[in-house]
């Protein structure tokens, strides 16, 4: 889980001739707001397809009135970020649509009128947790400057927000095979439960034993890159070990088609197939009207008889969004308690409960420990719908039936030897070291003739502590 964040820096006339008319006037003051729609992947998707990764609407910007005779400046923007939360893994590649809307504040009957000023779209690669990426997009004579990033919400970490960090249980170390979470060592990575060998960079799992691939990767362990064309591509040889190589540079690389247009190569150059409402060599010209049918899912289009006066969609029940493209997600209210899975069946909501919970909304907590026994003096602890045993010293495993090896985590520093003991463990330190865990060198200078060791980092036993 995490949040995609969009920061709009400016919206105003683009460079070049043909400055756009100001969207507001003294007679009709107005203010701007923005809408972002995110879809996973780089695949071609119709404009009608839902914002599967999520959507967000900004606040309204300050009221703006055009100064007579002055060119249209950068328009005043709303405060704050547009934030789109995502519940699952961040896909790594995504498509976006950013719409600039104006709200006219005249004396219209029925309150303010909304109209679409500009719509830009694109497809990008982005790793979660990285820095802000800056972008400039043009729609007709307008130019939009913005930055975006994806960040994970705790306890998720990693480029796809699929690794988990949990507070550590032992005071001085993480368990066997688990790494500490940067920057402070008070948390450890949760145990990875994906299929053995699943690529940590390109694969993820949400249930034990599975290996699901991020966009652009395939194979049972997500180690094979997906070719953007076929293996017979004239610019990229195939490889038996890694699958098809991504083709070399071509006229469509970087997608010269704006606003979600799809690019196809021609013998000499490229050709853009533009989505509804855009035209021009690179789909850079926008002029959406009701004649273009911009309202999806049976929405009623009002206004916008010509390109200079935009439209508004009145959505049927069950749909929302500026183009009625988004199904109302009744599950977004999270009606299922205790981690239950919400299913919107159209005619009704259904909750699929996790083990240990029951009821229409999973509101009843069953007794996890009923009839469960922990061996070797362990005690049963309820929680999360699955019983857990708190084991006595020297035992481990789900039911405390396994004899724990206190030396498995390599608890002795600086090459000390670990010996299991009835009361825990004992470290036999290498010469020159002391302490219960051999962590203190007796004479750190060794044979050095320097009067004092230099400050800062000294590798003691630099292999990672597993």
């Amino acid at each position: 889980a995490g949040v995609f964040e969009l920061q709009i820096h400016s919206f105003g006339p683009g460079p070049g001739p043909g400055a756009p008319r100001s969207p507001c006037s003294a007679r009709l003051p107005c203010r701007l707001f923005f809408r972002v729609c995110l879809k996973p992947g780089l695949s071609e998707e119709a404009a009608e397809s839902p914002c599967a990764l999520g959507a967000a609407l900004s606040a309204r910007g300050p009221v703006y009135t055009e100064q007579p005779g002055a060119p249209a400046p950068d328009l005043p923007l709303p405060d704050g970020l547009l934030q789109v939360p995502f519940r699952d893994a961040w896909p790594g590649t995504f498509s976006f649509i950013i719409e600039t809307w104006r709200e006219e504040l005249g004396d219209q009957i029925g309150g303010p009128a909304w109209s679409l000023l500009a719509r830009v779209a694109g497809r990008r690669r982005l790793a979660a947790g990285g820095p802000w990426a800056r972008d400039i997009q043009r729609a007709g004579a307008w130019e939009l400057r913005f930055s975006y990033r994806a960040r994970c919400e705790p306890p998720a970490v990693g480029t796809a927000c699929t690794r988990l960090c949990r507070p550590r249980s032992a005071p001085s170390r993480c368990g066997p095979g688990l790494r500490p979470c940067a920057p402070l060592e008070d948390e450890c990575e949760a145990p990875l439960v994906c299929r053995a060998g699943c690529s940590p960079e390109h694969g993820f799992c949400e249930q034990p034993g599975e290996c699901r691939c991020l966009e652009g990767w395939t194979g049972p362990l997500c180690t094979v890159p997906v070719s953007t064309s076929s293996c017979l591509s004239p610019r990229g040889p195939s490889s038996a070990t890694t699958g098809c190589l991504v083709p070399g540079p071509g006229p469509c690389d970087g997608n010269p088609c704006a606003n979600g247009g799809s690019c196809s190569e021609t013998p000499r150059s490229f050709e853009c197939t533009c989505p509804r409402g855009f035209y021009g060599l690179r789909c850079e010209v926008s002029g959406v009207t009701c004649a273009d049918g911009p309202c999806f899912n049976g929405g009623l289009c009002v206004g916008g008889a010509d390109p200079d006066s935009a439209y508004i969609c009145h959505c049927p029940p069950g749909f929302q969004g500026s183009n009625c493209e988004k199904r109302v997600d009744r599950c977004s209210l999270q009606p299922c308690r205790n981690g239950g899975l919400c299913l919107d069946l159209g005619h009704a909501l259904r909750c699929r409960c996790r083990a240990g919970f029951a009821g229409p909304r999973c509101e009843h907590d069953l007794d996890d420990c009923a009839g469960r026994a922990c061996a070797n003096g362990g005690t049963c602890v309820e929680g999360g719908g699955a019983h857990r045993c708190s084991c006595a010293l020297g035992f481990g495993g789900r039911d405390c039936r396994e004899r724990a090896d206190p030396c498995a985590a390599r608890p002795c520093a600086h090459g000390g030897r670990c010996y299991a003991h009835f009361s825990g463990l004992v470290c036999a330190c290498a010469p020159g070291y002391m302490g219960a865990r051999c962590e203190f060198p007796v004479h750190p200078d060794g044979a050095s003739a320097l009067p004092a060791a230099p400050p800062g980092l000294r590798p003691g036993d630099p292999q990672r502590y597993l």
Partner: nanobody
Framework: EVQLVESGGGLVQPGGSLTLSCAAS????????MAWYRQAPGKKRELVAG???????GYIDSVKGRFTISRDNAKNSVYLQMNSLRAEDTAVYYC???????????WGQGTLVTVSS
């Protein structure tokens, strides 16, 4: 990276007291094993007192009963309380940390303690 900054050194008369402080950043002291070392002119650096990540402490024989090592998790610091100081305690005192997560050791710059009448 863990950074250690010592303070509290100075000139003190025999039989007097001093408290040295070591402030850590980059990790929490409760996840480090930390110690005080000292180096007298012309001698090797030697371990004086240590406190493990689990809170257990240890001292060399010559300072037992006079020196006390302690840790304050809230201030992310380790201290060395030195009582009944002697001339032979004169040295540069260094703070040391062993980071279990990475198995690296870290040193501070040192603070000078002079015991003289």
């Amino acid at each position: 990276e863990v950074q250690l900054v010592e303070s509290g050194g100075g000139l003190v008369q025999p039989g007097g007291s001093l408290t040295l402080s070591c402030a850590a950043s980059g990790s929490r002291v409760s996840f480090l094993s930390m110690a005080w070392y000292r180096q007298a002119p012309g001698k090797k650096r030697e371990l004086v007192a240590g406190i493990s990540a689990d809170g257990s402490t240890g001292y060399i024989d010559s300072v037992k009963g006079r020196f006390t090592i302690s840790r304050d998790n809230a201030k992310n610091s380790v201290y060395l309380q030195m009582n009944s100081l002697r001339a032979e305690d004169t040295a540069v005192y260094y703070c040391y940390a062993y980071r279990w997560a990475t198995r690296y050791t870290y040193w501070g710059q040192g603070t000078l303690v002079t015991v003289s009448s």
